[in-house]
Interface confidence: medium
């Protein structure tokens, strides 16, 4: 399973960003991950 802070954040927020393959529905000015550090 994905265990980086990126994925933990995504699981807790119930969302993924395009960096990991799924786009969020609305813009939230919060850093949701580090898929490209």
């Amino acid at each position: 399973a994905c265990d980086t802070a990126t994925c933990v954040t995504h699981r807790l927020a119930g969302l993924l960003s395009r960096s990991g393959g799924v786009v969020k529905n609305n813009f939230v000015p919060t850093n949701v991950g580090s898929k490209a550090f």
Partner: antibody
């Protein structure tokens, strides 16, 4: 203009210590996740450490090769990132890059500094 | 640790030709793969993130594809400025890791 400027590199003897700094400007530093990535002369890239944003409690992660020897930290008030390197070894010789990252969900921002050279030699 | 293996190590092509670079992961990394370009004396530059998303300002001739363990960076028609070293990276598991690089040189 976005800038990440590393400093603090130089020549140090094995077993010695060095503190690298990375000064950020042109973006909201506290929102960014920052990594140090290094590159030994003529070699490939190696991730060293990561510190998350202020809102993520500035959580840290390290590569096994540096765990217990290196400490990553940030001072958001000064828009600065640090890497305290102790018990340095010859294999730590590299150019050290500071890398800033922010994920908006619909797009990302990714900034690299130009690097600072650390040479560990007697 | 997830190992990324890039191939070929060196790719010799001419301007105008199509370049195909491969990156294979030792474990499944879904789409948590990025591609970087590095020229001598310069910092790496992000080209592709999330396996297939072009980064800001990156020309359309660069494209990425793949998921799971097999990933590809394609440069549709090489420009003189494209000759450089290319690295893939993964951020699916700690530690984040990079491939060993593919050197794209002028034939």
């Amino acid at each position: 203009e976005v800038q990440l400027v590393e400093s603090g590199g130089g020549l140090v003897q094995p077993g010695g210590s060095l503190r690298l700094s990375c000064a950020a400007s042109g973006f909201t530093f506290s929102n960014y996740w920052i990594s140090w990535v290094r590159q030994a002369p003529g070699k490939g890239l190696e991730w060293v450490a990561e510190i998350r944003s202020e809102s993520d409690a500035s959580a840290t992660h390290y590569a096994e090769a540096v765990k217990g020897r290196f400490t990553i930290s940030r001072d958001n008030a000064k828009n600065s990132l640090y890497l305290q390197m102790n018990s340095l070894r010859a294999e730590d010789t590299a150019v050290y890059y500071c890398v800033g990252y922010f994920d908006y969900g619909l797009a990302i921002q990714n900034y690299w500094g130009q690097g600072t050279l650390v040479t560990v030699s007697s | 640790e997830i190992v990324l293996t890039q191939s070929p190590a060196t790719l010799s092509l001419s301007p105008g030709e199509r370049a195909t670079l491969s990156c294979k992961a030792s474990k499944r990394v879904t789409t948590y793969v990025s591609w970087y370009q590095q020229k001598p004396g310069q910092a790496p530059r992000l080209l592709i993130y999330g396996a297939s998303n072009r980064y800001l300002g990156i020309p359309a001739r660069f494209s990425g594809s793949g998921s799971g363990t097999d990933f590809t960076l394609t440069i549709s028609s090489l420009e003189p400025e494209d000759f450089a070293v290319y690295y893939c990276s993964q951020s699916y598991n700690y530690p984040y890791t990079f491939g060993q690089g593919t050197k794209l040189e002028i034939k």
